[in-house]
Structure formats: structure tokens, C-alpha cells
Amino acid sequence: EEELQVIQPDKSVSVAAGESAILHCTVTSLIPVGPIQWFRGAGPARELIYNQKEGHFPRVTTVSESTKRENMDFSISISNITPADAGTYYCVKFRKGSPDTEFKSGAGTELSVRAK
């Protein structure tokens, strides 16, 4: 098939308040060249959750776990989850440019938050 795939294997993730949530994303190619970013929600009002190159995201860490040749891991962990973090998270590949343009999005992972 044409070009790359953005794979979010988990349709949903449930996490207890105060714990960390791991949101998995693998990408099958670096080409076209450009960054990966994470968002909560879709459309123009979506919220940027993590951008590797710029910004301050103190609750987010990267958690690359894959050693497979066929894809690369762009998963993240969000610490100290609260009910306000509930929503659908998207791993999005951008194509490098001026400005960068959205190339392909994962299907999304719905995060739900359980009481402690």
C-alpha cells in the first residue's frame, strides 16, 4: 500500500486516577519526513499533548518499546492521570514543510479514567 501507516493498536485504555496511562503508537516508515505529534480530540479545537521538538510537556514521557524492524515506536506515557484527561488521543504524522502539514493520523485511543 502507499506510503506509511500510523498504528494505534488500543481502541481504548482505562486507567485509575493518579496512575500513568501508556498510549501506544507505531509508524511503519520515516518517509515522508516529518514529526509525530500527539493530540487529544480531533478537528481545529484539538489539544496538543506532545510534540518532541518544541513545547513543555512535564507529564509526558516517551516510552519506545519496540525492537521490531518493521515499525518504530512513538508511544507516550502520561503521568498522574485525572478525570480531566479523559478523551480520545490521536498519534499524528506530519509531513515536513513550511509549515508542517498533517499527513496521516492513527485511529485514536479512547482514555477513560476510573476512580481511585
Partner: antibody, heavy 118, light 111 residues
Framework: EVQLVESGGGLVKPGGSLRLSCAAS????????MSWVRQTPGKGLEWVAT????????YYPDSVKGRFTLSRDNAKNSLYLQMNSLRAEDTAVYYC???????????WGQGTTVTVSS | DIVITQSPASLAVSLGERATISCRAS??????????MHWYQQKPGQPPKLLIY???NLESGVPDRFSGSGSRTDFTLTINPLQAEDVATYYC?????????FGGGTKVEIK
């Protein structure tokens, strides 16, 4: 068994043109990013060009941008590098290489030699 | 451009001993915890062959006496124990950012 076989190298005068070809077999060519890498005794290994699996996106270093054009024919499992306005510094062994993820070069051909000299 | 400084340029090691090669990038080649530095072996008259991908992952079919480590800007290839068939030139390569670049190579010989 994966095979990448380059052809089209030779002796050409400065300012001239050459078209290199790479015939691929033993893997799903249309799923792979493909590249050319060249090697000279003086400069070592140098990345020359890359094309996405579907052929939509191409990338070149400044040293060849505007002079070299990379294309592919997935129906023929073939990769092509059109080299124009050749310079003496383009003299090298040119390798065709595959990249499953567009990252590391997983398979390399045996290379074809390009000599640019008057 | 990311410049890769590979050292040493040549290395003589006794059979059965450890060979260590270093590559330092002028800026980080990491993204999301992936280190986009790779290692290749080239024997005379042959093309390069992938040994290690993404800093520390052994390519299928490569003997486990080869190992890679490092992150961000500093990376190491280790051969332990060195065998006669490991005589070759070794190159590192970064694909963290365009233009992709290579180290200058390390020629490994038997002492």
C-alpha cells in the same frame, strides 16, 4: 533471497548524463523506501537520494539537488537515478539500497561504478 | 547537517579480545526514545551489510558477538570476542534528520 542489481554506470565527461537502474527481487518492492548511496575512497559513504514506497516523495542532499532525479516503477520492481550535469566529484561506486522503514539501509546491491572525467 | 565523528580510524585487536568503535553525532539523533543510529560492516569488494539498527537492535542473522549501545549523540559498536571473519571496515549512519550522514569508517584488523 533479496537481490538488488545495479546497472548503467560508466565513463562520462563533465556536464554529461547517466541513468542508473536497480532491479529488485526477493522482496515486496512496492512496500520499501528505496535509496542510492555512493562511496568514494576520499569521502567515504554519502547518501544520494531516497524515494518513498509509492514514489510520491523524493529527497536529496544539497550536493545533488537539481541535478539528480530519482524515480521508481513498482510494476517492474525497478529503481532509476537520472544524473545530469555530472561533475568530477560525482565519481563513485553507486549502491542501490532498500529501507523497510525509511530508516536503516537493510539490503544493498553490489554497486555500479560511475567515473566523470574528461 | 548532523556531522558524525567516528573513532578510531583504525583498530588492531587480538583474536578473542574486545573491539570497541565509537560514533559521536553533532546533535541528537533520538526521537521518542528511538535512536536513529545504525552500524554496517563492509568487507573489501563487497557492499555494506547492516549489523545493528536503531542503536542496539541486532539484525537478523548477525552473530551476537556484535552489540550496539548509546543514545542521543554517543554510540558504541562492540565486537566481543573478535573473530578472524570480523576483519572489515565498520560505519555508523544516522537517519535522525536529513541529510542522512555516515561516519568516516573504522578499519578493524587482527593484532
Amino acid at each position: 533471497e533479496v537481490q538488488l542489481v545495479e546497472s548503467g554506470g560508466g565513463l562520462v565527461k563533465p556536464g554529461g548524463s547517466l541513468r542508473l537502474s536497480c532491479a529488485a527481487s526477493g522482496f515486496t518492492f512496492s512496500s520499501y523506501v528505496m535509496s542510492w548511496v555512493r562511496q568514494t575512497p576520499g569521502k567515504g559513504l554519502e547518501w544520494v537520494a531516497t524515494i518513498s514506497s509509492g514514489g510520491t516523495y523524493t529527497y536529496y542532499p544539497d550536493s545533488v539537488k537539481g541535478r539528480f532525479t530519482l524515480s521508481r516503477d513498482n510494476a517492474k520492481n525497478s529503481l532509476y537515478l537520472q544524473m545530469n550535469s555530472l561533475r568530477a566529484e560525482d565519481t563513485a561506486v553507486y549502491y542501490c539500497a532498500s529501507q523497510l522503514t525509511g530508516s536503516e539501509f537493510d539490503y544493498w546491491g553490489q554497486g555500479t561504478t560511475v567515473t566523470v572525467s574528461s | 547537517d548532523i556531522v558524525i565523528t567516528q573513532s578510531p580510524a583504525s583498530l588492531a585487536v587480538s583474536l578473542g579480545e574486545r573491539a570497541t568503535i565509537s560514533c559521536r553525532a553533532s546533535e541528537s539523533v533520538d526521537s521518542y526514545g528511538n535512536s536513529f543510529m545504525h552500524w554496517y560492516q563492509q568487507k573489501p569488494g563487497q557492499p555494506p551489510k547492516l549489523l545493528i539498527y536503531r542503536a542496539s537492535n541486532l539484525e537478523s542473522g548477525v552473530p551476537d558477538r556484535f552489540s550496539g549501545s548509546g543514545s542521543r549523540t554517543d554510540f558504541t559498536l562492540t565486537i566481543n570476542p573478535l573473530q578472524a571473519e570480523d576483519v572489515a571496515t565498520y560505519y555508523c549512519h544516522q537517519s535522525g534528520d536529513l541529510p542522512w550522514t555516515f561516519g568516516g569508517g573504522t578499519k578493524v584488523e587482527i593484532k
